[in-house]
Amino acid sequence: ECVTQLLKDTCFEGGDITTVFTPSAKYCQVVCTYHPRCLLFTFTAESPSEDPTRWFTCVLKDSVTETLPRVNRTAAISGYSFKQCSHQISACNKDIYVDLDMKGINYNSSVAKSAQECQERCTDDVHCHFFTYATRQFPSLEHRNICLLKHTQTGTPTRITKLDKVVSGFSLKSCALSNLACIRDIFPNTVFADSNIDSVMAPDAFVCGRICTHHPGCLFFTFFSQEWPKESQRNLCLLKTSESGLPSTRIKKSKALSGFSLQSCRHSIPVFCHSSFYHDTDFLGEELDIVAAKSHEACQKLCTNAVRCQFFTYTPAQASCNEGKGKCYLKLSSNGSPTKILHGRGGISGYTLRLCKMDNECTTKIKPRIVGGTASVRGEWPWQVTLHTTSPTQRHLCGGSIIGNQWILTAAHCFYGVESPKILRVYSGILNQSEIKEDTSFFGVQEIIIHDQYKMAESGYDIALLKLETTVNYTDSQRPICLPSKGDRNVIYTDCWVTGWGYRKLRDKIQNTLQKAKIPLVTNEECQKRYRGHKITHKMICAGYREGGKDACKGDSGGPLSCKHNEVWHLVGITSWGEGCAQRERPGVYTNVVEYVDWILEKTQAV
């Protein structure tokens, strides 16, 4: 059962796993949620009645019964992890803690104009977990405006003390705000020869990479496959770091794979969710339960529903034994990974899907594309919405994209002459405009946020956000699309599609069925040559065939230019403007979304 509220002046007795330091009870709850075994916690706030050495302690706890006896204690705040909850979870913590010095290994000291600049520096530094900034009022003259970047083995402070005139905070890497490069490549036959900070067992290099991503100290990894010559090292995932942040030596070795932490792209690819099944593979660990199950899929469901289960092994039924049900072994370990992985015993293994809610919803795989044709099928573009105006009569106005459960991203030029959000309706999960009747449910618009530098589509900043009056419940037909990572600026997208109900030629009408067209991206230099009378800025992106024929057109505005990269769809562009429609050597011009990620996050994450 999901319990979100905190219990004041209450302490959970026993069940201690480990103690960390956090600046608040709220953050203690987040740390507990992300810890592989923690189900409950007790945090000690600063209080005159408490020993100062116990202030800010966050004791992570576990219990077979999922609860522990409660004891009254002043200044103690207790609660439950969000593991038991179904809602989306994020480790993003933008809070700034005044008069707190969060202790760690101070590895960089520099002058910063503000705490915000210090936090940005931490976010863009590969090693930084948190920072402390001495304000202008700090007593020591030489330390005023000093920004200390810090890291620890756990990613949380080793101690927190009161210190007047300083502020502390965490890196915003987990808020998708880092400018660090996002390197998704996995290098075959490669060993990174740098210091190991930890090692775990993993069934493949992808799981190893995901484990590296959410390990606070891991910057890159090496994985030894099951064909690795040294038997004791098979399926070993070595988590690594280096002072420079990059591997110092790469050694060519067959049957080894290496790669990088995906911390700078973790909002747009799954890092917690290991959804694959591993056939003829047994995961060893502490046994939680053995239950009968019809299939390995059913076994995974059982594991997902058992809050303490981390991974499982399913042994299929022998012939007609046990009504055709096999044995489902629910397992756990201290770090969430199997203690050993064995092959050739006939088992089918996998992981709990409970952690999938820690990943961005937008990373979920959607149904396969229908190849060929121009008409879409239901659920093919679940982020696409149709934005209607009701004044003077109801009609399709623009396209848009779901980017959060209360947010639609669209183009600013759609709102020319729109006096109030009250006349707007957002319809999601729609394939045909004819489906929209008087009683069709829609989302009202609470607020229209237009970029304050927007003047006209051709001069850029053609971007707007719609805040919905109610939240979108994600389903197969309505779900968000990922924003591109800032660290992905150099990615060359090759699988891009423009979608919308817009005209199919310049003098036409709105289409009934959602149309799709695969369109190649065009470099800004090439695009500039085609639009000599305009300035094609880096905040714009162009797409189109040289010979024309396929393009976005009137009515598609505000809709997505969606590009698939590493099995995840990204909102690369917003349909903005162009000369005519699908004209030869006149590519469509789109708002380059990656350049507005900060603006989007600032507006959507505002308290």
Partner: antibody, heavy 124, light 107 residues
Framework: EVQLVQSGAEVKKPGASVKVSCKAS????????MHWVRQAPGQGLEWMGI????????SYAQKFQGRVTMTRDTSTSTVYMELSSLRSEDTAVYYC?????????????????WGQGTTVTVSS | EIVMTQSPATLSVSPGERATLSCRAS??????LAWYQQKPGQAPRLLIY???TRATGIPARFSGSGSGTEFTLTISSLQSEDFAVYYC?????????FGGGTKVEIK
């Protein structure tokens, strides 16, 4: 042993420039600030400026602004102080002195390690 | 800039006696004050920082007090090696400034 070793005495003509070096050893060079202080013959101590060897940022006393340049070379753990447009009143002993430890935040400190001093004489 | 004024300019004391040196700031420097000792031909040596904290290796006979604008350095029992010039310095605002010094001589 923590020490600061300065370059030797200099004799300069008015209008010339002088560059004094200060080599640090026995500690992490980039973790502490470095000050320059001078003392004219028979006079008191006068603060000239400060450099943060980590980032190279500087702050100078108004009196020396435009004439003084403080730099550092992290590869040799050395800081430099260059004073240009010398005049006779710049005749003094120039000291480098280690300042605050910048890798930790604390309230109070002093200049705890000093170089042996470099005598600069400006005379025509 | 903050002006630091030391008094007296010269203090004549017999060995074994107590010496009290004063330093006044033209505006509050909180506790951001240090004391240095300088002997002829030598570089200054840090004695006290934070107005009252003894630097490493400084004997207990040296003590500092005060905050705001009024500060005192006390040498409880003068030894022969203590005869020197003493400077106070503020660390509260740029530019850092020193007092004119107090010369402690043998009476």
């Amino acid at each position: 042993e923590v020490q600061l070793v300065q370059s030797g005495a200099e004799v300069k003509k008015p209008g010339a420039s002088v560059k004094v070096s200060c080599k640090a050893s026995g500690y992490t060079f980039t973790s502490y600030s470095m000050h320059w202080v001078r003392q004219a013959p028979g006079q008191g101590l006068e603060w000239m400026g400060i450099i943060n060897p980590s980032g190279g940022s500087t702050s100078y006393a108004q009196k020396f602004q435009g004439r003084v340049t403080m730099t550092r070379d992290t590869s040799t753990s050395t800081v430099y102080m260059e004073l240009s447009s010398l005049r006779s009143e710049d005749t003094a002993v120039y000291y480098c002195a280690r300042g605050a430890y910048l890798m930790e935040l604390y309230y109070y400190y002093g200049m705890d390690v000093w170089g042996q001093g470099t005598t600069v004489t400006v005379s025509s | 800039e903050i002006v630091m004024t030391q008094s007296p300019a010269t203090l004549s004391v017999s060995p074994g006696e107590r010496a009290t040196l004063s330093c006044r700031a033209s505006q509050s420097v909180s506790s951001n004050l240090a004391w240095y000792q300088q002997k002829p031909g030598q570089a200054p040596r840090l004695l006290i920082y934070g107005a009252s904290t003894r630097a490493t290796g400084i004997p207990a006979r040296f003590s500092g007090s005060g905050s705001g604008t009024e500060f005192t350095l006390t040498i409880s029992s003068l030894q022969s090696e203590d005869f020197a010039v003493y400077y106070c310095q503020q660390f509260n605002d740029w530019p850092l400034t020193f007092g004119g010094g107090t010369k402690v001589e043998i009476k």
